[in-house]
């Protein structure tokens, strides 16, 4: 399911409960995706010892995964709501190709991988409604994404395992940073 249970606007099972605000819905959606990532990481960590490796040991990779930096305005120091929101949406859009790569990379958690992908699409929609400055958001080029996907899928097994681990870890860190920032807005 792309949305946490009870989040569908058609859900009237609890009429006494106040409908979630836009911020609460985004917060819950991120936590739902993080739970999904946690389940996927369990499977990858059971298969290899990469999860125990330090970040430095895994730093040498040619993946250009989105990462929060001071200039993005999402940290406590230098916080800027609008700049940060643009970064979060842009980063999530950039992660989409990597989430596509994750499909078919899991045996027992195939549905979970799909749920993470679909939930991220929903999250992007929620955030786009919140953003005022949509013009500043750059969408990745589909042709570039397609060739990147082909390149990633052509790697040997060990590199594919490494790539899967790095994507999950980076996506988790990006979402955690995003959640911390959104809770300050």
């Amino acid at each position: 399911a792309p949305v946490p249970p009870g989040e569908d606007s058609k859900d009237v099972a609890a009429p006494h409960r106040q409908p979630l605000t836009s911020s609460e819905r985004i917060d819950k959606q991120i936590r739902y995706i993080l739970d999904g990532i946690s389940a996927l990481r369990k499977e990858t960590c059971n298969k290899s010892n990469m999860c125990e490796s330090s970040k430095e040991a895994l730093a040498e990779n040619n993946l250009n995964l989105p990462k929060m930096a001071e200039k993005d305005g999402c940290f406590q120091s230098g916080f800027n709501e609008e700049t940060c929101l643009v970064k979060i949406i842009t980063g999530l859009l950039e992660f989409e190709v990597y989430l596509e790569y994750l499909q078919n990379r899991f045996e027992s958690s195939e549905e979970q991988a799909r749920a993470v992908q679909m939930s991220t699409k929903v999250l992007i929609q929620f955030l786009q409604k919140k953003a005022k400055n949509l013009d500043a958001i750059t969408t990745p080029d589909p042709t570039t994404n397609a060739s990147l996907l082909t390149k990633l899928q052509a790697q040997n097994q060990w590199l594919q395992d490494m790539t899967t681990h790095l994507i999950l870890r980076s996506f988790k860190e990006f979402l955690q940073s995003s959640l911390r920032a959104l809770r300050q807005m």
């Epitope: 991120i30 946690s38 430095e56 406590q76 955690q176």
Partner: antibody, heavy 118, light 109 residues
Framework: CQSLEESGGRLVTPGTPLTLTCTAS????????VTWVRQAPGKGLEWIGI?????ETAYATSAIGRFTISKTSTTVDLKMTSLTAADTATYFC??????????????WGQGTLVTVSS | IQMTQSPSSLSASVGDRVTITCQAS??????LSWYQQKPGKAPKLLIY???TLASGVPSRFSGSGSGTDFTLTISSLQPDDFATYYC????????????FGGGTKVEIK
């Protein structure tokens, strides 16, 4: 066995800068969030700040501008400036396993005592 | 976000049921932890996510609550449980004075 150890605590005069170091044994700090907490004699726990990745930090309102947290793969430093007698406390570092979104501190050092007195 | 703990101290006997409460100034979902601290020692994580027992913690400890109101319960107080207990919100560590509550000292009656 995994553990944390704080060092650098000592007697200093007011205004003297001081750096405390948190050192990990049995694991790499790069995979975890690290927080600093202090406790004045006979008082409760006071949260100071946290370092997430290599460059994202958050600080308590009272610590902003005076305290700075930085990180390497094996250590986390707490740099303190403009110290006063009110900063006299035992300083603890603690680890957050960073697996979830909420902050919780599941491994603590034994603390290092900082005394600020003229 | 401010955390208010009560009572600040209480006296109880071995075998008693003890309840400590913690209130957040705004909703923190279930993102609350409880710690136990003994004199001269570092705090120890007891409960996280309001109700999940940390590894190795006896089942006589339990936590409940969500939103702004939380409770730590010791079902049958043991000699080893006389200590100070702290709640800590993990919802947001930005622009806060303290993540911890003021503490509750559990003393022998």
């Amino acid at each position: 066995c995994q553990s944390l150890e704080e060092s650098g605590g000592r007697l200093v005069t007011p205004g003297t800068p001081l750096t405390l170091t948190c050192t990990a044994s049995g694991f790499s700090l790069s995979n975890y969030y690290v927080t600093w907490v202090r406790q004045a004699p006979g008082k409760g726990l006071e949260w100071i700040g946290i370092i997430y990745g290599s460059d994202e930090t958050a600080y308590a309102t009272s610590a902003i501008g005076r305290f700075t947290i930085s990180k390497t793969s094996t250590t986390v430093d707490l740099k303190m400036t403009s110290l006063t007698a009110a900063d006299t406390a035992t300083y603890f570092c603690a680890r957050d396993d960073s697996s979830d979104w909420d902050a919780k501190f599941n491994l603590w050092g034994q603390g290092t005592l900082v005394t600020v007195s003229s | 976000i401010q955390m208010t703990q009560s009572p600040s101290s209480l006296s109880a006997s071995v075998g008693d049921r003890v309840t400590i409460t913690c209130q957040a100034s705004q909703s923190i979902n279930n993102e609350l932890s409880w710690y136990q601290q003994k004199p001269g020692k570092a705090p120890k994580l007891l409960i996280y996510r309001a109700s999940t027992l940390a590894s190795g913690v006896p089942s006589r400890f339990s936590g409940s609550g969500s939103g702004t109101d939380f409770t730590l319960t010791i079902s049958s107080l043991q000699p080893d449980d006389f200590a100070t207990y702290y709640c800590q919100q993990g919802y947001s560590l930005r622009n806060i004075d303290n993540a911890f509550g003021g503490g509750t000292k559990v003393e022998i009656k």
